[in-house]
């Protein structure tokens, strides 16, 4: 006998009805007398509603459930599950038994929407640029867990410094609380989403914040102007600087140094303590500096994967900012060469020079010459490939055709080191091999 | 130069989560930003975000916001994307690949991808 | 977001013909564009990255012009080998993305 029900679940919301599909084709001559109608759940086998004996022998589940009774006998087994509860939610299995038997199982699923979440500040008041601040976003009753999105004024994602929790309360329903810690800007509007993801609901709430200004104007915060240079695995120094007013102390400093692009902490000093690095634990202060403006930062074993722009934020009663780029590099090793084919080489011939130089940043340019100093253009292949730590290896290949002799240079400079590396072979006119036999 | 190996190909229903995984080797992990990218049969690619396992920083193309989470864990060199919520649209070959920092967006080794398919 | 349009979808051509691929920014990129090749069945690979690095590997006949928005991908003597579909990227800024793709078929 087949028994068929939705293959979907049948989403329910919190103290509604929900009808739980259930369906059979009976033969002709089919009557109520013949139908044994079982509904239990699918994973207890608890017994939920049946009907046998030609009679509907009534609800075991609360008395909150029905079947339809004048559709029964066109095949219509559905089951009408009243009021809804989160703790329904399940699998229903439909048993049919007329001459045959045959059986399937529909999952119901709970729903409710969440409320338009309220948003508290902490502090809420003489709130100033470079404060931290927590942001709580509440949501109300809903059914299941909601995920929850947090995003600035330009609808960029936040999501570090983020902490939801939910509950269920006395219903079972989910109260959900998501905390945003973030540095106040000169302004800026913050935005929570709280999604339902049953039913694709999102409620949503934002709290634009304008700070204080105080009258004497912004803090003034100074950077090098340039990028600071750092080579691959040394400790590198992004200098920022502040003017300290008379009697200031540091418990009046919020310092937070941050990604500049995707606004993530690096480092903070905060209530008059150093809140250490949320940067693998590879940045540092320079705390018995700090009272004197010195709000630099020290970045160590520097990576490739560092290099970009970093944004020293300094508030005290008043806010300011700046932000400063840290360019890694590598030196290149000196040049190894090659050649090929490397004997019995002869005027006329056609070889190919191949220069390679290892683990140096960035990208290297790489210049070829002959004995003269003259350029070498044409024929030049070069490539470049990152090796496990992200530094690259240059491989520049030239192809030429052997004079009477010759010495062909190459060049490989580090353009932000300003750093070149020489590497050269000579090719004799008479039959050599290379490199020379000793 | 380092290799970048996907789990299997998955198929799931509409509504379920999926978590596809990345283990790498060959090249220092924590040295690389690690980024997952769409393709749909036929179609070009879609940027998701970025992990860098160091700080454990992401960056999130706002399109998959909410849609995808990324994590690491640094023992084994593995990188992880779960996939929330899931419709026919994330019918894709998702790819993990890598690239050398946040403002060198470009990828030079890529796994061989995960073929999820949504489907009821 | 910035748009990556490759105007053209299909480019049929005989080997050993030189092909060009024409790749447009809706913003300027500078020179942070780079290219990939993907052949059925596979990942993309990298191939020029930076407007004009070639990645290690990379044969020659790939070359790489242009900057700002307007960018031209091409290829001095196509090989049987260099039949697939052809994407450019903006690396500039996130969220990083990719033109539509241009498949190189043959006549």
């Known amino acids: 006998l087949e028994v068929q029900v939705p293959e979907d679940p049948v989403v329910a919301l919190v103290g509604t009805d929900a009808t739980l599909c259930c369906s059979f084709s009976p033969e002709p001559g089919f009557s109520l007398a013949q139908l044994n109608l079982i509904w239990q759940l699918t994973d207890t086998k608890q017994l939920v509603h049946s009907f046998a004996e030609g009679q509907d022998q009534g609800s075991a589940y609360a008395n909150r459930t029905a079947l339809f009774p004048d559709l029964l006998a066109q095949g219509n087994a559905s089951l009408r599950l009243q009021r809804v509860r989160v703790a329904d939610e399940g699998s229903f299995t439909c048993f049919v038994s007329i001459r045959d038997f045959g059986s399937a199982a529909v999952s119901l699923q709970v729903a409710a929407p969440y409320s338009k979440p309220s948003m508290t500040l902490e502090p809420n008041k003489d709130l100033r640029p470079g404060d931290t601040v927590t942001i709580t976003c509440s949501s109300y009753q809903g059914y299941p867990e909601a995920e929850v999105f947090w995003q600035d004024g330009q609808g960029v994602p936040l999501t570090g410094n983020v902490t939801t929790s939910q509950m269920a309360n006395e219903q079972g329903l989910f109260d959900v609380h998501s905390i945003l810690r973030v540095v106040l800007g000169a302004n800026g509007t913050y935005s929570c989403l709280v999604r339902n993801p049953v039913l694709q609901q999102d409620a949503h709430s934002s709290v634009t914040i304008t700070p204080q200004r105080s009258p004497t104007g912004a803090v003034e915060v100074q950077v090098p102007e340039d990028p600071v240079v750092a080579l691959v695995g040394t400790d590198a120094t992004l200098r920022c600087s502040f003017s300290p007013e008379p009697g200031f102390s540091l418990a009046q400093l919020n310092l937070i140094w941050q990604l500049t692009d995707t606004k993530q902490l690096v480092h903070s000093f905060t209530e008059g303590r150093d809140q250490g690095s949320a940067y693998a634990n590879r940045t540092a202060l320079f705390p018995d500096l700090l009272a004197q403006g010195n709000a630099s930062l020290r970045l160590q074993r520097v990576r490739v994967a560092d290099e970009g722009s970093f944004t020293c934020f300094v508030s005290i009663r008043d806010f300011g900012s700046a932000a400063v780029s840290l360019q890694v590099a590598a030196p290149y090793s000196k040049p190894s060469m090659t050649l090929e084919p490397n004997k019995d080489l002869r005027p006329g011939d056609t070889v190919t020079i191949t220069c390679s130089s290892y683990r140096g940043y960035p990208e290297a340019e790489v210049f070829w010459q002959d004995g003269q100093g003259v350029p070498l253009t044409g024929n030049v292949t070069t490539s470049q490939m990152a090796n496990e730590q992200g530094l690259f290896d240059v491989h520049s290949v030239l192809r030429v055709v052997l004079g009477a002799n010759g010495t062909y240079s190459c060049l490989v400079r580090n353009p932000v080191l300003q750093q070149d590396a020489h590497g050269s072979v000579t090719i004799t006119g008479q039959p050599m091999t290379f490199p020379p036999e000793a | 130069q380092g290799q970048m190996q996907q789990s299997g190909a998955e198929l799931v229903k509409p509504g379920a989560s999926v978590r596809l995984s990345c283990k790498t080797s060959?090249?220092?992990?924590?040295?690389?930003?690690i980024s997952w990218l769409k393709q749909k049969p036929g179609q070009s690619l879609e940027w998701i975000a970025w992990i860098y396992a160091g700080p454990g920083y992401t960056s999130y193309n706002q399109k998959f916001t909410g849609k995808a989470q990324l994590t690491v864990d640094t023992s084994s060199s593995t990188a992880y994307m779960q996939f929330s919520s899931l419709t026919t649209e994330d019918s894709a070959i998702y790819y993990c690949?890598?690239?050398?920092?946040?403002?060198?967006?470009?990828?030079?080794?890529w796994g061989a991808g995960t073929t999820v398919t949504v489907s009821s | 977001d910035i748009v990556m349009t490759q105007s053209h979808k299909f480019m049929s051509t005989s080997v050993g013909d030189r092909v060009s691929i024409t790749c447009k920014a809706s913003q300027d990129v500078s020179t942070a564009v780079a290219w990939y090749q993907q052949k059925p069945g596979q990942s993309p690979k990298l191939l020029i990255y930076s407007a004009s690095y070639r990645y290690t590997g990379v044969p020659d006949h790939f070359t790489v012009s242009g900057s700002g928005t307007d960018f031209t991908f091409t290829i001095s003597s196509v090989q049987a080998e260099d039949l697939a579909v052809y994407y450019c990227q903006q690396h500039y800024s996130t969220p990083w993305t990719f033109g539509g793709g241009t498949k190189l078929e043959i006549k």
């Open positions: 060959g090249f220092t992990f924590s040295s690389f930003y």
């Open positions: 690949a890598r690239h050398v920092g946040r403002q060198r967006g470009y990828f030079d080794v």
